[in-house]
Interface confidence: medium
């Protein structure tokens, strides 16, 4: 629908509270270094302007696009050039180039201080003193650190954040009530951010067709009773929502997401029997619930796929008439029958089917040529099955921490040029696949594991893209979205790598390690492990294990010592010498 004033339309649709929250998220995701107070001032100015447009849609500037209005506002920031450097050049451009320019300058790894959680009493006081500012600060801090966070979902997180403080700041034991809730929100938030980052990468790097294929496969698994045309409708609408959010059009995105949730709930009879509970919830909870809803049961007596897609004499005719719709039908039919497959596997199968038809429909005897196409699927299915089986066995044998260490060594040897913090972060996340997925029965392991690995490897890809250092990473990240994981799995030790010079400073530790949380201590040890492998890429598992065991013993000993700092200095030198000898450095 054409509206005289887009800003008035969105303000009326979303309401003032959501409008202000979404504009704050949008601004914080674009100008990630700006102080909170500056953003709040800009948001208030935009909101006051929006209200004048609601009162009179014909008022001056009310007919301007949201990109024009928001971009003009961002470009009033006085310190733009000093703070953001070349990003200030965006302001010399006209829309839509200016918005594209802002998008290109979003930083996945902004140089911002780690968020330190204050004491519970301090947080509760701040919450009671000014609830609105406290919650805005939460939106701001998350949005600037996660510039692709799914904005309508961040509103849902903020709602839960508020609920946690409302409940726990009145509790007898505030900390016991609040801290687990905050931990859960933090972990879920990181996962949500990473999942959305993959959706945006899919759209931006591989195009709408790639995203739609992913959505057809996932929604067909989730809603196997829905007709193909219904799934296609949902895919089209979902693609619009994510295109908008990934493009910084957060007001449109939130509005369209609400419309999609409304449509799904009004048509749940033709979509899924699992939606009833979701559809009884308020809007933010409803949308989140729908996005996470379990797969519906598969319809009984689904016929064999071979009849329509291999045996039929009309395969090439159907394919030629409308390739994408026919391939979409193939993907839909395959996915609804296989909730036990990962989405990326389903997409590999569809790609194989497409490649076969491209070749065979031009052949002298097409049917003879594509008759065995389903046989080509077998190795593609077995590869992730075997990999998951092996890695789950390893995880069960080692436990999460040591499993992460095994992956750290494996990935450092594959791509040693990648920065140590990135290797640690990515390998730790890869290692979490064990506790996340290996507990599941066989039928749920692959969709859990391989689709999770796609999300984690995308983190590696976006971090590496900012500062490319490895041709192998670039190749695996850019050649094929669905083959990223097999590409990284297939990498062997990089024989071209020149080992890093030994630097004793890297292996010098201090008493502050003793006061760290268990997680932080693990990260310190894992950082040292990556550095060891970079110095000695040919070190055996046994050698590395011996050094790491010595290192753990050294930390434990010195943390128990009376004079910790002296212990770390003296014992540390001995450890470095012993390690050098053990590894032949």
């Amino acid at each position: 629908d054409a509206h005289k004033s887009e800003v008035a339309h969105r303000f009326k649709d979303l309401g003032e509270e959501n409008f202000k929250a979404l504009v704050l998220i949008a601004f914080a995701q674009y100008l990630q270094q700006c102080p909170f107070e500056d953003h709040v001032k800009l948001v208030n100015e935009v909101t006051e302007f929006a209200k004048t447009c609601v009162a009179d849609e014909s008022a001056e500037n009310c007919d301007k696009s949201l990109h024009t209005l928001f971009g003009d506002k961002l470009c009033t920031v006085a310190t733009l050039r000093e703070t953001y450097g070349e990003m200030a050049d965006c302001c010399a451009k006209q829309e839509p180039e200016r918005n594209e320019c802002f998008l290109q300058h979003k930083d996945d790894n902004p140089n911002l201080p780690r968020l330190v959680r204050p004491e519970v009493d301090v947080m509760c006081t701040a919450f009671h003193d000014n609830e609105e500012t406290f919650l805005k600060k939460y939106l701001y801090e998350i949005a600037r650190r996660h510039p692709y966070f799914y904005a309508p979902e961040l509103l849902f997180f903020a709602k839960r954040y508020k609920a946690a403080f409302t409940e726990c700041c009145q509790a007898a034991d505030k900390a016991a009530c609040l801290l687990p809730k905050l931990d859960e929100l933090r972990d879920e938030g990181k996962a949500s951010s990473a999942k959305q980052r993959l959706k945006c990468a899919s759209l931006q790097k591989f195009g709408e067709r790639a995203f739609k294929a992913w959505a057809v496969a996932r929604l067909s698994q989730r809603f196997p009773k829905a007709e193909f045309a219904e799934v296609s409708k949902l895919v089209t609408d979902l693609t619009k929502v994510h295109t908008e959010c990934c493009h910084g059009d957060l007001l449109e995105c939130a509005d369209d997401r609400a419309d999609l949730a409304k449509y799904i709930c009004e048509n749940q009879d033709s979509i899924s029997s699992k939606l009833k509970e979701c559809c009884e919830k308020p809007l933010l909870e409803k949308s989140h619930c729908i996005a996470e809803v379990e797969n519906d049961e598969m319809p009984a007596d689904l016929p064999s796929l071979a009849a329509d897609f291999v045996e039929s004499k009309d395969v090439c005719k159907n394919y030629a008439e409308a390739k994408d719709v026919f391939l979409g039908m193939f993907l839909y039919e395959y996915a609804r029958r296989h909730p036990d497959y990962s989405v990326v596997l389903l997409l590999r199968l569809a790609k194989t089917y497409e490649t076969t038809l491209e070749k065979c429909c031009a052949a002298a005897d097409p049917h003879e040529c594509y008759a065995k196409v389903f046989d080509e699927f077998k190795p593609l299915v077995e590869e992730p099955q075997n990999l998951i089986k092996q890695n789950c066995e390893l995880f069960e044998q080692l436990g999460e921490y040591k499993f992460q260490n095994a992956l750290l060594v494996r990935y450092t040897k594959k791509v040693p040029q990648v920065s140590t913090p990135t290797l640690v972060e990515v390998s730790r996340n890869l290692g979490k696949v064990g506790s996340k997925c290996c507990k599941h029965p066989e039928a749920k392991r692959m969709p859990c594991a391989e689709d999770y690995l796609s999300v984690v490897l995308n983190q590696l890809c976006v971090l590496h893209e900012k500062t490319p250092v490895s041709d192998r990473v670039t190749k695996c990240c850019t050649e094929s979205l669905v083959n990223r994981r097999p590409c990284f799995s297939a990498l062997e030790v990089d024989e071209t790598y020149v080992p890093k010079e030994f630097n004793a400073e890297t292996f010098t530790f201090h008493a502050d390690i003793c006061t760290l949380s268990e997680k932080e201590r693990q990260i310190k040890k894992q950082t040292a492990l990556v550095e060891l492998v970079k110095h000695k890429p040919k070190a055996t598992k046994e050698q590395l294990k011996a050094v790491m065991d010595d290192f753990a013993a050294f930390v434990e000993k010195c943390c128990k010592a009376d004079d910790k700092e002296t212990c770390f200095a003296e014992e540390g030198k001995k450890l470095v010498a012993a390690s050098q000898a053990a590894l032949g450095l």
Epitope: E227, S232, M329, E333
Partner: nanobody, 119 residues
């Protein structure tokens, strides 16, 4: 009983336009995706366009993309096909059908309306 009744066919010159209609009854039209298919003389069936029950999305065969527009009016239980820039190869009997639940099989058909494009 499901009934689909097409109309609007006729003879038209190349480059000309026609608008086909399909009146539906006997089923819940507003919850059914619909499509147009055609059969040229001596040829097999070719699907032309699909429209979702809500009106979006729509899909078109590559051969008609940019020239044909499918639409529907759920309040009138009617499906439409606006055909512009007609070519000789568009000559066929046009049928409206209820979109298949999943496989490439069509449950319900109309009797068809003939479109002839000739100079």
């Amino acid at each position: 009983e499901v009934q689909l009744l097409e109309s609007g066919g006729g003879v038209v010159q190349p480059g000309g336009s026609l608008r086909l209609s399909c009146a539906a009854s006997g089923f819940t039209f507003d919850t059914s995706s619909m499509l147009w298919v055609r059969q040229a003389p001596g040829k097999g069936l070719e699907w032309v366009s699909v429209i979702h029950q809500s009106g979006t999305p729509t899909y078109y065969a590559d051969s008609v993309k940019g020239r044909f527009t499918i639409s529907r009016d759920n309040s009138k239980n009617t499906l439409y096909l606006q055909m512009n820039s007609l070519r000789a190869e568009d000559t066929a009997v046009y049928y409206c059908a209820k979109f298949p639940s999943s496989r490439m099989k069509f449950d319900y058909w109309g009797q068809g309306t003939l479109v002839t494009v000739q100079s």
